[in-house]
Structure formats: C-alpha cells, structure tokens
C-alpha cells in the first residue's frame, strides 16, 4: 500500500483561512527552541493552483515579523516543496480542514538533515483535543514525546495577529 495520507477531500482550498500553531517537534531541539529557525507560527493559509501559501509569524527582536512562504505542489498529493532555511520536503500528515492540521518536514540545510513536525488548529480553545493525534504522528515518524514543545500564548506571537 502507498502510505502517505492524502490532501483534504474537498481539495486544498479547505485549508484556507486562519490557523494557530499549537505544538512543534524536532529531532534537533535547537530548531524549535526560542529563536530557533523553526520556532515559527502559522497565521493564515491559502491555496492556489495546488500550491500552499502561508503567512507565518517569526519572532524577531522582541517583535513578530509576518513572512509569506509558498509550498509548491509535487507529483505526490500530500507532498510539497518549500524553501525555508534550506530545502524542505513538506508532508501533510493528518488533515481535518475545519479543526486541525499536522504536517512534518524533512529539512536539508547544507549537509544537515532534520525532521520537524507542526500541529496547528483552527480554534485554540480545542488545542488539547488534537495533541494526542500529534503525539501519535510524531511517534510514527520517530519523534518522541520529550521532543515535542507545546506552545503558550506568549510563544505564539498572539499580539501580532490582526
């Protein structure tokens, strides 16, 4: 069987709109520590021509800078190519467009390869509901519970959201 989960049934357009980052995980803890290159937070997403466009919030000098990134579609439905701090093979692991999204990235920066996973939700008040699913995906790809960081409101650049 071909393993990877598919994109949402109604297409990527269903992922459009506001999202909130809830948890991050990586085999390289420095990447998701404060000021780590992957300690970034989703603000919103949209889809066009099969590509995913994301506005992310990056903490910088006590402020949060909004940056736009595009993950380009590939021949595999749930896989995207993203240039951010090197090259990333970005996979949509588990998607419920109305509730939560789990993605993971295999990042290659110079000669270093890392694995980073990200849980985002539509409604922050329900974040606890989706942490078990995130832990399960992380375990499946080889990231342990102690490699997961659950974000607080302070972490998330909440003040920078319009």
């Amino acid at each position: 069987q071909e393993g990877n989960h598919e994109e949402p049934q109604g297409g990527l357009e269903e992922l459009s709109g506001r999202w909130h980052s809830v948890a991050l995980a990586s085999n390289k803890s420095d990447l998701i520590k404060p000021w780590g290159h992957f300690r970034v937070f989703i603000h919103s997403m949209s889809a066009k021509d099969g590509n995913l466009h994301g506005d992310i919030l990056i903490p910088q000098d006590g402020q949060c800078e909004k940056v736009s990134l595009t993950a380009f579609k590939t021949a595999t439905s749930n896989k995207f190519d993203l240039e951010y701090w090197g090259h990333n093979d970005l996979y949509l692991a588990e998607v419920d467009p109305k509730s939560y999204l789990i993605l993971y990235m295999i990042n290659q920066y110079n000669d270093d390869t890392s694995l980073v996973a990200h849980l985002m939700v539509r409604d922050l008040s329900r974040q606890q509901d989706f942490l078990p699913a995130f832990e399960s995906v992380c375990e499946d790809i080889g990231l342990h519970k102690d490699q997961i960081v659950v974000l607080s409101d302070d972490d998330r650049c909440q003040g920078s959201r319009d």
């Epitope: 069987q1 071909e2 390869t113 499946d140």
Partner: nanobody, 122 residues
Framework: QVQLVESGGGLVQAGGSLGLSCAAS????????MGWFRQAPGKEREFVAA????????HYAEAVQGRFTISRDNAKITVYLQMNSLKPEDTAVYYC???????????????WGQGTQVTVSS
C-alpha cells in the same frame, strides 16, 4: 537487536519491474522506521526510500519517486520495495535498514542487511 535479510534481487531489462523483500527477526520490528538504500559500483551508498513505523508515512529519493513503492507488513515483519520502470542507472546493491526516525540519512539507521544485487540491462 534486529537482523535483516534482503531477497528478490536479480537481472531485469530496462523498463521492467522487480520486487525486493526484507525479512526482519525480532519482535520489535514496528518500533523501527525502515529504509532502503543502494550502492552502485564505485559510488557511495544513497538513500532510496523510507517508511514510518505504522506504514502510514513514506519518503522517497527524487530519483525513484513515482517509480518505486515502499511498504511494510508489521505482522509478517517484512518491508518491501516494488520497483517499476527500471533504468540501467538503478543497477546497485540494495540494502534494507532499520532506524529510529523517518530520515534519508544513513547515520540514523542502526541495523543493516547484507544487500541484494539488482542489475538492469539496457
């Protein structure tokens, strides 16, 4: 400790198909991410494909994406590599490996098989 034994290699014509199997020993098979690597004559060993512990998630080298399919059967403690549309440049010794994390890097795999030869003739 996991022991891995590959089978299914052989000689095939370009455009043909071949299926490799890797049988593991030990009851901890589903604790491991499984991968396939290959080494062509005079070249370094390179990543081919990997599959997560449950089999839900896979990752492929660009060179084989769309042609090769990795799968696993945790009940049979076996991982498979189905290779279609083979090219002469796929000629190599193919190694099965067990590791901790879904990554395309040799160093993250702890256990290795002895390899099976795949030769694709033009």
């Amino acid at each position: 400790q996991v022991q891995l034994v590959e089978s299914g290699g052989g000689l095939v014509q370009a455009g043909g198909s071949l299926g490799l199997s890797c049988a593991a020993s030990g009851r901890t098979f589903n604790n491991y991410v499984m991968g396939w690597f290959r080494q062509a004559p005079g070249k370094e060993r390179e990543f081919v494909a990997a599959i997560s512990r449950s089999g839900s998630f896979t990752h492929y080298a660009e060179a084989v994406q769309g042609r090769f399919t990795i799968s696993r059967d945790n009940a049979k403690i076996t991982v498979y590599l189905q290779m279609n549309s083979l090219k002469p440049e796929d000629t190599a010794v193919y190694y099965c490996a067990a590791g901790a994390i879904l990554m395309p890097t040799e160093r993250t795999y702890d256990y290795w098989g002895q390899g099976t030869q795949v030769t694709v003739s033009s």
